[in-house]
Amino acid sequence: IWELKKDVYVVELDWYPDAPGEMVVLTCDTPEEDGITWTLDQSSEVLGSGKTLTIQVKEFGDAGQYTCHKGGEVLSHSLLLLHKKEDGIWSTDILKDQKEPKNKTFLRCEAKNYSGRFTCWWLTTISTDLTFSVKSSRGSSDPQGVTCGAATLSAERVRGDNKEYEYSVECQEDSACPAAEESLPIEVMVDAVHKLKYENYTSSFFIRDIIKPDPPKNLQLKPLKNSRQVEVSWEYPDTWSTPHSYFSLTFCVQVQGKSKREKKDRVFTDKTSATVICRKNASISVRAQDRYYSSSWSEWASVPCS
Amino acid sequence: RAVPGGSSPAWTQCQQLSQKLCTLAWSAHPLVGHMDLREEGDEETTNDVPHIQCGDGCDPQGLRDNSQFCLQRIHQGLIFYEKLLGSDIFTGEPSLLPDSPVGQLHASLLGLSQLLQPEGHHWETQQIPSLSPSQPWQRLLLRFKILRSLQAFVAVAARVFAHGAATLSP
């Protein structure tokens, strides 16, 4: 058993049929010695008396809020949560496996630049009695500070018969050094509590590996005289690191119709303009990627050919 | 060329060669993103590698103030990786595929380090650690880790030279 926060404790249980469970001793936080009784949740049934209560925790019915009283007055609470371990593996029932970029990916994180700011998100089908707490650091043995905000519900989607909820959190490295080569990864730890179930999820990454620039901005077209060609120009996204002579992007420019199966024109460039062939009912799209490190491409920025 | 005395390097040449190094480092190990090598005790095996750190003056302001600190650090790293790529970690079993770009990568590391430090001038270089794994599978894992680390190192070097070529060239 360990303390998650004040008056909230996590009991780690090997979860299998007829498991013996864990013996837990609860102590009432009071100077009083006599006349103390214990109850669980809303029940008025007295579970025991005395300053300590010894219980055998085997299942979710044994978890919950234990309260010690004296003469009708509440003295203190202890909330017991269960963390299940099945076949040596901690349960991951609360969050959905996003399976990208690999199986058992519960947390996904992205950064728009090298400033040390990043966003992580996760998915669940659970709608109520759900809380998250996020901690982060740079490195684990001698951790350096990363500050995370509160996790918030950022999107709701309908997936077949189920509703899916996306939560996200923003974090900022306290002393970020955008130009340095990272040697220790960022660690992100998410505590998830659903009713009386506790789970924790972790992710470890370098900012450079989760970079995904915003799409290029201000796409403009200029038809070339006596030609089918069009000069397309754009600018670096506002959120990208500066100066651009140091933090450079490379771009992919594509002309394509509405269907992915249609023919296309495509060219890669390090410049912020390119000449392409525009077709009726097609769109010109541009996306960006770090020029020197192959992290994710941005989403496309598009303008119609006409 | 970046001479210890403090003259300027051939920024544009260094830019071109460092960008080539980036391309080669990714072709040598393109599936980097699909392997989470940090789970394999990454900190013990590659923490001896010279990283370009915050105080090394490789940020735009540091380069403007005095690029020599940064260039020395980059040179140190290039020599270090050049030695690693020539060591039995890469020459031993399992043999590299004949079309592996590691050979080109090795030659380009040497080429850039020579651009930075001509014959007869010597910056101190970092001692190469004795990473000599006994098992072929350990060697394979170490190769991946070294190439992954090299990708990060050459990316920073390429940014330095691109910025230098754009803003510090005579």
């Epitope: 089918r228 296309k264 890669f268 | -």
Partner: antibody, heavy 118, light 107 residues
Framework: QVQLVQSGAEVKKPGASVKVSCKAS????????LHWVRQAPGQGLEWMGW????????EHAPKFQGRVTMTTDTSTSTAYMELRSLRSDDTAVYYC???????????WGQGTMVTVSS | EIVMTQSPATLSVSPGERATLSCRAS??????LHWYQQKPGQAPRLLIY???QSISGIPARFSGSGSGTEFTLTISSLQSEDFAVYYC?????????FGGGTKVEIK
């Protein structure tokens, strides 16, 4: 499968014109760009231009501007390349090539030998 | 127009050996570079597109690398059917241009 079949060899006099055909099969004709590339005997490849069979748009290499006409007949899935004012240095194998991507060549015809000789 | 230069013009290699072919552009072309193989009396065949992207059906011994102005086609272990002429082609800007070719012959 995607296939391009070209017309047979031609012998022409200097100053004459030649029209080479390229019949496509195995795909929807308007779904691919069509290019013409030539190769003089013992020489390398030279791009001449492209046509979009969907709308008839064309773009030629400056070298052939005014001397080449590229057309298509969607009813027969056939592309044509006419080269006028032939000179002896136009002697070459003329290839049609196609791709969904505009700027490189995925599928090639077998080539048509055009000899220009007086 | 962009001039593409291939070297060497002829490469003599023994079967089973590795062949490295070079292609240089007269200006930076990012990764807008494609490789073709041509055997005598046949049309060219696309091997690699956008500098390093492999084509399904092309043996894995063919690989491409490079960006900017310098590109390489590597044939890891030459088979008898690989003796041919290889061309690079830039697609950075029109007119599209080819290199002069590298003939890979049996040593």
């Amino acid at each position: 499968q995607v296939q391009l079949v070209q017309s047979g060899a031609e012998v022409k006099k200097p100053g004459a014109s030649v029209k080479v055909s390229c019949k496509a099969s195995g795909y929807t004709f308007t779904d691919y760009y069509l290019h013409w590339v030539r190769q003089a005997p013992g020489q390398g490849l030279e791009w001449m231009g492209w046509i979009d069979p969907e709308n008839g748009d064309t773009e030629h290499a400056p070298k052939f501007q005014g001397r080449v006409t590229m057309t298509t007949d969607t009813s027969t899935s056939t592309a044509y390349m006419e080269l006028r004012s032939l000179r002896s240095d136009d002697t070459a194998v003329y290839y049609c090539a196609a791709n969904k991507e505009l700027r490189y060549f995925d599928v090639w015809g077998q080539g048509t030998m055009v000899t220009v000789s007086s | 127009e962009i001039v593409m230069t291939q070297s060497p013009a002829t490469l003599s290699v023994s079967p089973g050996e590795r062949a490295t072919l070079s292609c240089r552009a007269s200006q930076s072309i990012s990764i807008n570079l494609h490789w073709y193989q041509q055997k005598p009396g046949q049309a060219p065949r696309l091997l690699i597109y956008f500098a390093s992207q492999s084509i399904s059906g092309i043996p894995a011994r063919f690989s491409g690398s490079g960006s900017g102005t310098e590109f390489t086609l590597t044939i890891s272990s030459l088979q008898s059917e690989d003796f041919a002429v290889y061309y690079c082609q830039q697609s950075n800007s029109f007119p599209l241009t080819f290199g002069g070719g590298t003939k890979v012959e049996i040593k």
